[in-house]
């Protein structure tokens, strides 16, 4: 729900970074819709999820995703770089056994159909912002964020702390 | 240890302002963001702001906007809440209070300070 | 802004009864609450955050639950050292609020 730093040097703490414990600090059921207020919506297509990005039509029912809240440990770093220490993480599985994954090679993504424990590319670190907004960055890939492109979800590079306020990677959690 | 260490009380005259500080240490100071909240005196807890210590970033309640100024000195470890035109109704207790999680700002505190008495009185 | 109702704002209790606080959210904040202890001029402590986990060194007598818009606080069995003002806070949304506190005293 607020304010954030600005893209630090993450990248050698995110790699050695580790979840604290094997169980989330809390898990709940939520809708996942864009800045804009389109909604993110799972279709089953050819035994594939697909992700999209769609406005709703009236009293259409949205898609809720089960977040997994974790913490995360970092080594300490006394670099000055504002990146050791407890991290919060999230994983996001709008189905059973199916996770939202990180392709970084594709800068896409996907979910997943994986056993426990989860691979990085599912985890994402949790940022606040300050418009009640919330960004998802993704932990093998510091600096690269969940967004939105060409109504799909996409992995977008953020590389100065001004972008980190765009529209396109700013999502909103709701109950409904 | 992590320790969050507050000046001292302090006297003002309405209309006058007040810098509170609070000196943290037992942790990488940069990593973490700091809150200010305050309480009146015997009453509730009230949340006036934050601030990134990274990057000076802040984000003040509305109901302080134009009138608290967050700052923190990286070189010493310390943050600052400076609170202007200040009136009867400020006098409370001041806390600083360290979040819960490095990287961002999700509200969760595990630290606070000792707290600073703020008087205002004519 | 997001109101929080903390019942009762005060409770009676003896040493080794099980009390019990409840706070009401004006809206939904998922899992997002913390319960803080307040003995007179000190400040707050955590003892529970994101609505049921127990900060590292708070004794287990102390438990949180609850989601969306209605949690509690419950000492299992009260000691002697628990007689203190209890507060809650949503973490969901700006600004951050607090509930107005519930002062437990000696019977």
């Known amino acids: 729900a607020f304010g954030i730093s600005g893209v630090q040097k993450y990248t050698r703490a995110l790699h050695d970074s580790s979840i604290t414990g094997i169980s989330p600090i809390t898990e709940y059921l939520a809708s996942l819709s864009t800045y804009n207020d389109q909604s993110i919506t799972f279709a089953l297509e050819d035994e594939s999820y697909e992700i999209y990005v769609e406005d709703l039509k009236k009293d259409e029912k949205k898609d809720k995703v089960l977040l997994s809240y974790y913490e995360s440990q970092h080594p300490s770093n006394e670099s000055g770089d504002g990146v050791d220490g407890k991290m919060l993480m999230v994983t996001l599985s709008p189905t059973k056994d199916f996770w939202l994954h990180a392709n970084n090679k594709e800068h896409s993504v996907e979910l997943h159909k994986c056993e426990k424990p989860l691979p990085d590319q599912a985890f994402f670190v949790l940022h606040n912002m300050h418009s009640n907004c919330v960004s998802f960055e993704c932990k093998t890939d510091p600096g690269v964020f969940i967004g939105v492109k060409d109504n799909h979800l996409a992995l977008i590079k953020v590389d100065s702390s001004e972008n980190l306020c765009t529209e396109n990677i700013l999502f909103k959690l709701s109950e409904t | 240890q992590v320790q969050l260490v507050q000046s001292g009380a302090e006297v003002k005259k309405p209309g006058a302002s007040v810098k509170v500080s609070c000196k943290a240490s037992g942790y990488t100071f940069t990593s973490y963001g700091i809150s200010w909240v305050r309480q009146a005196p015997g009453q509730g807890l009230e949340w006036m702001g934050w601030?990134?210590?990274?990057?000076?970033?802040?984000n003040y309640a509305q109901k302080f906007q134009g009138r608290v100024t967050m700052t923190t000195d990286t070189s010493t470890n310390t943050a600052y809440m400076e609170l202007r035109t200040l009136n009867s109704d400020d006098t409370a207790v001041y806390y600083c209070?360290?979040?819960?999680?490095?990287?961002?700002?999700?509200?969760?505190?595990?630290?606070w300070g000792q707290g600073t008495l703020v008087t205002v009185s004519s | 802004d997001i109101q929080m109702t903390q019942s009762p704002s005060s409770v009676s209790a003896s040493v080794g009864d099980r009390v019990t606080i409840t706070c009401r959210a004006s809206q939904g904040i998922f899992s997002w609450l913390a319960w803080y202890q307040q003995k007179p001029g000190k400040a707050p402590k955590v003892l529970i955050y994101a609505a049921s986990n127990l900060e590292s060194g708070v004794p287990s007598r102390f438990s949180g639950s609850g989601s969306g818009t209605d949690f509690t606080l419950t000492i299992s069995s009260l000691q002697p050292e628990d007689f203190a003002t209890y507060y809650c806070q949503q973490a969901n949304s700006l600004p951050l609020t607090f509930g107005g506190g519930t002062k437990v005293e000696i019977k």
């Open positions: 601030i990134r210590a990274y990057n000076g970033y802040t």
């Open positions: 209070a360290r979040d819960r999680y490095s990287g961002s700002f999700h509200g969760n505190f595990d630290y």
